[in-house]
């Protein structure tokens, strides 16, 4: 299995390889078979990355930043393969690599442009700040700078605040949106154009539910088919907001099909889960169960948030006792 890397062929013996931060990649290079093979890989025409000749590696003058990170496909050199296996790429490795291959027949040089992308899975958070409600799309580490777009009820929103902090090798980005008093659905898309990777966060507010004490409530949570792929690992979390912070009631991991329940009155229907329906029941409601309930379905490619507001009212009996 080859490491993740895209090869884009461009003219003049030059190829573009796109790799991901901290993953392994292959810089491709091939040549016409011949005896006395010499392979020299260099970075930006200055730094020695890897040298091979007279049947073995010669790494005495290898630049220290490449130590223990490079190797060739030794069994394939005689077949014309001079590709370089490159471990744990960093953003500092971006640039032009030249492969010099010489044999008794000819000498060729190939250029490979390495571009490195970062895309740590973004998150969509729902936050209360005083009386305001915010949706925040954030990505802890991304490179190059991503494109972030917001939609309200499937219509693009021009207002797009972006809080950006740059570190040595990537950006950390927050994009908050004030949704106070809104019943609309919201969607945030973060796109890494280099890695051709897109993540989507979707937030839906359900109609408020009014329940009586001691009753049970059923809260729906079904993924939108546009985003949801049951073959992909995902996690479902149900939480309740209390005094501005969420406490987790239960969660489900698709990889292990494990359900962990922290609230004894919470129940999930196993059969519904198998049909990708993560609706839940909360039994024996009491007044303190009033509040906002959040269903979060998350994978590497999306986060789907569904908010339910539950109002628990005293039953007639309780009211008359008071």
């Amino acid at each position: 299995i080859f490491p993740l890397a895209f090869f884009i062929y461009v003219p003049m013996n030059e190829q573009i390889v796109i790799g991901r931060l901290d993953e392994d990649i292959i810089l491709p290079s091939s040549f016409e078979r011949g005896s006395e093979v010499v392979i020299h890989w260099k970075y930006q025409d200055s730094y020695k990355v890897h040298s091979y000749y007279k049947g073995s590696d010669h790494l005495e003058s290898q630049d220290p930043r490449y130590a223990n990170r490079t190797s060739l496909f030794y069994n394939e050199i005689q077949n014309g393969n001079a590709s370089l296996f490159f471990r744990r790429v960093s953003l500092l490795d971006e640039g032009i690599y030249t492969c010099y291959v010489g044999t008794a027949i000819q000498v060729i040089t190939n250029k490979v442009v390495l571009k490195v992308g970062v895309f740590l899975t973004p998150v969509m958070k729902y936050e209360k700040r005083n009386t305001n409600s915010f949706l925040i799309c954030s990505v802890l580490s991304v490179y190059p700078r991503p494109i972030i777009t917001w939609k309200m009820d499937n219509t693009p929103i021009s207002e797009n605040n972006m809080e950006e902090t740059g570190s040595l090798d990537s950006f950390s980005i927050n994009s908050p949106l004030n949704i106070t008093g809104s019943n609309s659905s919201y969607e945030c898309t973060i796109e890494n154009s280099l890695l051709k990777q897109t993540w989507t966060g979707r937030w839906t507010m359900k109609d408020g539910l009014h329940k009586m004490q001691s009753e049970h409530v059923s809260l729906s949570c079904q993924p939108v088919n546009d985003y949801f792929s049951p073959n992909q690992d995902f996690k479902v979390t149900w939480s309740r907001m209390k005094s501005g912070t969420f406490s987790v009631l239960a969660y489900y991991l698709s990889s292990s099909q494990n359900t962990i329940i922290n609230e004894s009155r919470f129940s999930w229907n196993k059969e519904l889960i198998n049909q990708s329906d993560f609706s839940m029941n909360l039994m024996d409601l009491n007044l303190s169960d009033s509040g906002e309930y959040l269903c979060n379905i998350s994978s590497d490619e999306y986060t789907l948030l569904t908010i339910h507001t539950v109002h628990v009212e005293p039953s007639q009996e309780t009211a008359s006792h008071n």
Epitope: K48, Y53, K54, Y100, G102, A104
Partner: antibody
Amino acid sequence: QVQLVESGGGVVQPGRSLRLSCAASGFTFSNYGMHWVRQVPGKGLEWVAVIWYEGSEKDYADSVKGRFTISRDNSKNTLYLQMNSLRVEDTAVYYCAKDLISGIYYVDHWGQGTLVTVSS
Amino acid sequence: DIQMTQSPSSLSASVGDRVTITCRASQGISNYLAWYQQKPGKVPKLLIYAASTLQSGVPSRFSGSGSGTDFTLTISSLQPEDVATYYCQKYQSAPFTFGPGTKVDIK
């Protein structure tokens, strides 16, 4: 076809300097290592120095180390040998020679040579 | 540094004779050895590389053998145009030292 033409030889006094040049044509100069080899008339061949294809590595015979400097200008397809602190025993025909590949192999083409005479 | 020696330093043989020249390295050099021919008044010419591989255009009467420290250049049937001095050179690592040469002429 490969052509190597040396120049810069002549008569020089001991302790003085001289710079030899070698103009290369008929091949992609920047792809190949280059050597200087010398020969006292009527005597054997003595390897002097080598420079890799891109100039990053250089090696010298012990007899010239610290006095001679090999260099190249790939944009001009030219190889140089800067000879300082010349001695009588440096008198020889100096050949510019092309390496098989990058500068770590044998010589597969030779120039005609330029005579350097060190004499007081 | 590795020293290269050659024997004999000179030899005379008749046309058609088999001629053998030996080259010895003071330490092992695998098969990283080349042989050159230099005719009087001419520049050297590559005959053999990798101890035994004939350079293209070189007559098949020339052959090389050996590995490690001991190497041989053989002319299977000496011809008048083979009158020259023959040098071995090691290229396993710098310095790429030449042997002192073996002068071959016709009896």
